[in-house]
Interface confidence: low
């Protein structure tokens, strides 16, 4: 008799793929633009990335550091009107993109939470949650919660409001903290909260260190759903050298949880390459005319247009990974097992029942390495075959689809491999 199929877990929409943050509408849309109507015109691009949700804003009225002049129910007229917002929601819905609204109150000011008037602000947030849920948003984000006194209890209350409206609504909290204990204490009292943090932000050093961070986090959070990013708002290039961007894209898309990216991560957008542009929100490079300040500063391979035409680009890799992440059961909700593969390497398996399985091997080092995959670290349910097919490499030059002998696996510097192999009874 055929073995019984494992029961599928309940999956929410944010379990099925990546979230895409657009914190700065003006920077995302570029010169002379920066409103909700313009963003609506970019939804096809978001669809092409196969992201499941758009984390937007903040876009509410906020006169910096002035609680009285901060209105979480009003859209700053610079961004557009409620009608524009409604139209954006409807268009996003048609394209199956959910919209999450950032309600970080004092986003233009010194302290995101007006430290001296916590209760007033908390009431405003509560009112705003009700208001925007009725308006049709799919969830909320609040950032810098380390600046919010009694954050855990407020988050629990806001989570109740959000989930009380519908189980299909999401609350994301962001913190600058990278401390696991602080992160766990925020998660403890808030079931289903998606938390973005700086936990992985210093992971770029070695494969061992990254493996240790990831496994510690997964062990500590148990079977709750995680999110993966390097910070609550900033670009990957703020933390990573260019040569590790592909590796991290592969890792973030294949770890168990929701990958969260900032606009521009898909093309390796780097503020440091654009003089005068703010680190946390450089202008999005749609094409070479997107940054006219310094002629010649932007080459085609830095832009969406240029990378769209190049199958070997970072953007093309992002699209492929996003596609795989959203349709393969083992990547959607499969079990995760990390195992030893040798110094400098981080490797793991994703598998779900009798579905196709995935092996990820990541070389964080700047020298080529032979992988010594220690299959003995794996449980019987996740055993390794002798060969696996190469689905993709982060580096050019490998023949995709070809079977690779796992005992003889060699990786280039900063190379990541995604291999697939069938379930074997």
């Amino acid at each position: 008799r055929a073995p019984r199929c494992r029961e599928l877990p309940a999956q929410k929409w944010w379990h099925t793929g990546a979230l895409y943050r657009i914190g700065d509408l003006q920077a995302f849309q570029g010169h002379g633009a920066g409103n909700l109507a313009g963003l609506k015109g970019r939804l096809d691009y978001l669809s092409s990335l196969k992201v499941k949700g758009l984390v937007l804003g903040p876009i509410h009225k906020n006169q910096k550091d002035d609680v009285a002049q901060t209105d979480l129910l009003q859209i700053d007229p610079n961004f557009g009107s409620k009608e524009d917002f409604d139209s954006l929601l409807q268009s996003a819905k048609k394209k199956s993109i959910r919209v999450i609204l950032d309600l970080t109150p004092n986003y233009r000011g010194e302290n995101s939470w007006f430290s001296t008037q916590v209760d007033t602000v908390a009431t405003k947030v509560k009112d705003a949650l009700e208001f925007w849920l009725q308006a049709g948003v799919d969830g909320f984000q609040v950032r810098d919660i380390e600046n919010l006194k009694d954050a855990s209890s407020f988050l629990a209350e806001w989570q109740n409001i959000t989930k009380g409206f519908s189980e299909d609504r999401l609350l994301i909290a962001g913190t600058n903290s990278s401390d696991l204990q602080q992160i766990l204490s925020l998660l403890e009292s808030n079931k289903d909260l998606l938390l973005t943090s700086s936990y992985l932000s210093d992971s770029g050093s070695t494969g061992e260190h990254t493996k240790s961070l990831v496994t510690q986090y997964l062990n500590a959070t148990g079977n709750r759903w995680c999110s993966w990013s390097l910070s609550q708002a900033r670009l990957l290039t703020s933390f990573l050298p260019a040569q590790l961007l592909r590796l991290y894209q592969l890792m973030l898309f294949t770890l168990p949880g929701t990958p969260v990216f900032s606009y521009g991560d898909e093309i390796g957008l780097d503020a440091a390459a654009l003089p005068g542009q703010p680190m946390e929100a450089p202008v999005m490079l749609w094409d070479e005319s997107s940054f006219p300040d310094i002629p010649g500063a932007v080459s085609a391979n830095m832009t969406v247009k240029g990378q769209s035409e190049d199958p070997g680009s970072l953007l093309s890799l992002f699209r492929r990974l996003s596609d795989q992440r959203s349709k393969e059961r083992s990547l959607l909700h499969g079990d995760f097992h990390a195992f030893s593969a040798g110094p400098g390497l981080f490797s793991y398996i994703r598998h779900w029942d009798q579905n196709e399985r995935f092996l990820v091997v990541l070389n964080f080092g700047d020298v080529g390495l032979s992988a010594g995959l220690q299959a003995s670290d794996l449980p019987a349910s996740a055993s390794l075959p002798a060969k696996a097919d190469l689905l993709l490499s982060t580096q050019p030059g490998r023949e995709e689809g070809s079977p690779l002998e796992l005992e003889r696996l060699k990786l280039e510097p900063h190379e990541g491999l995604l291999l697939r192999f069938p379930y074997a009874a």
Partner: antibody, heavy 121, light 110 residues
């Protein structure tokens, strides 16, 4: 309350480099998306924007002074600095440091009290 | 970058209203709503009076108002008072991510 205070020599010889420092108190220079700027005012004349450094370290300068100006940030001391090379008597002015921002709040809300720099041999 | 153009001086009697103009180009005043106005008394640092064309910071009298049409911004002071006598400067952010100031206007209260 944020306060800015300029410091540096009041007298600089022609062809030398003018160096000024602005010390920021009441807030961290690296904590928000602010434009830390230098502005000068020639005696009896109007204000002239020299340049800014963003908290991330990015700089922008007045095109007419660009070849001679360097603005830098020292987050450990909560200071930012101005260097103006190859000075002449035309660089004699009151030099102000000021803050704009964050993000789209593109006006100067905090100013130092100004320091007079005279270029003379 | 050229300075914004302001009249060198304006004057008015107490209680009257005066308007100071500030003319720029399509790269600054016309392009953005990032026009600000500053008051400066002799020997003092400038003080922000108006930002984003027409907004007043807290503590600034409602007698001060700002507006813009095309590439010209204006500062109006109503109910002129003796303490309003000072130099006034306009400023704009520019499309080159720089700032530019006006030449300044000396306001005399007669």
């Amino acid at each position: 309350q944020v306060q800015l205070q300029e410091s540096g020599p009041g007298l600089v010889k022609p062809s030398q480099t003018l160096s000024l420092t602005c010390t920021v108190s009441g807030g961290s220079i690296s904590s928000g998306a602010y434009y830390w700027s230098w502005i000068r005012q020639h005696p009896g004349k109007g204000l002239e924007w020299i340049g800014y450094i963003y908290y991330s370290g990015s700089t922008y300068y007045n095109p007419s002074l660009k070849s001679r100006v360097t603005i830098s940030l020292d987050t450990s001391k909560n200071q930012f600095s101005l260097k103006l090379s190859s000075v002449t008597a035309a660089d004699t002015a009151v030099y102000y440091c000021a803050r704009a921002g964050p993000k789209w709040e593109l006006w100067f809300d905090y100013w130092g009290q100004g320091t007079l720099v005279t270029v003379s041999s | 970058q050229s300075a914004l153009t302001q009249p060198a001086s304006v004057s008015g009697s107490p209680g009257q209203s005066i308007t100071i103009s500030c003319t720029g180009t399509s790269s600054d005043v016309d392009n953005y709503n990032y026009v600000s106005w500053y008051l400066q008394h002799p020997g003092k640092a400038p003080k922000l009076m108006i930002y984003d064309v027409s907004n007043r910071p807290s503590g600034i009298s409602t007698r001060f108002s700002g507006s813009k049409s095309g590439n010209t911004a204006s500062l109006t002071i109503s109910g002129l008072q003796a303490e309003d006598e000072a130099d006034y400067y306009c400023s704009s952010f520019t499309s080159s991510s720089t700032w530019v100031f006006g030449g300044g206007t000396k306001l005399t209260v007669l």
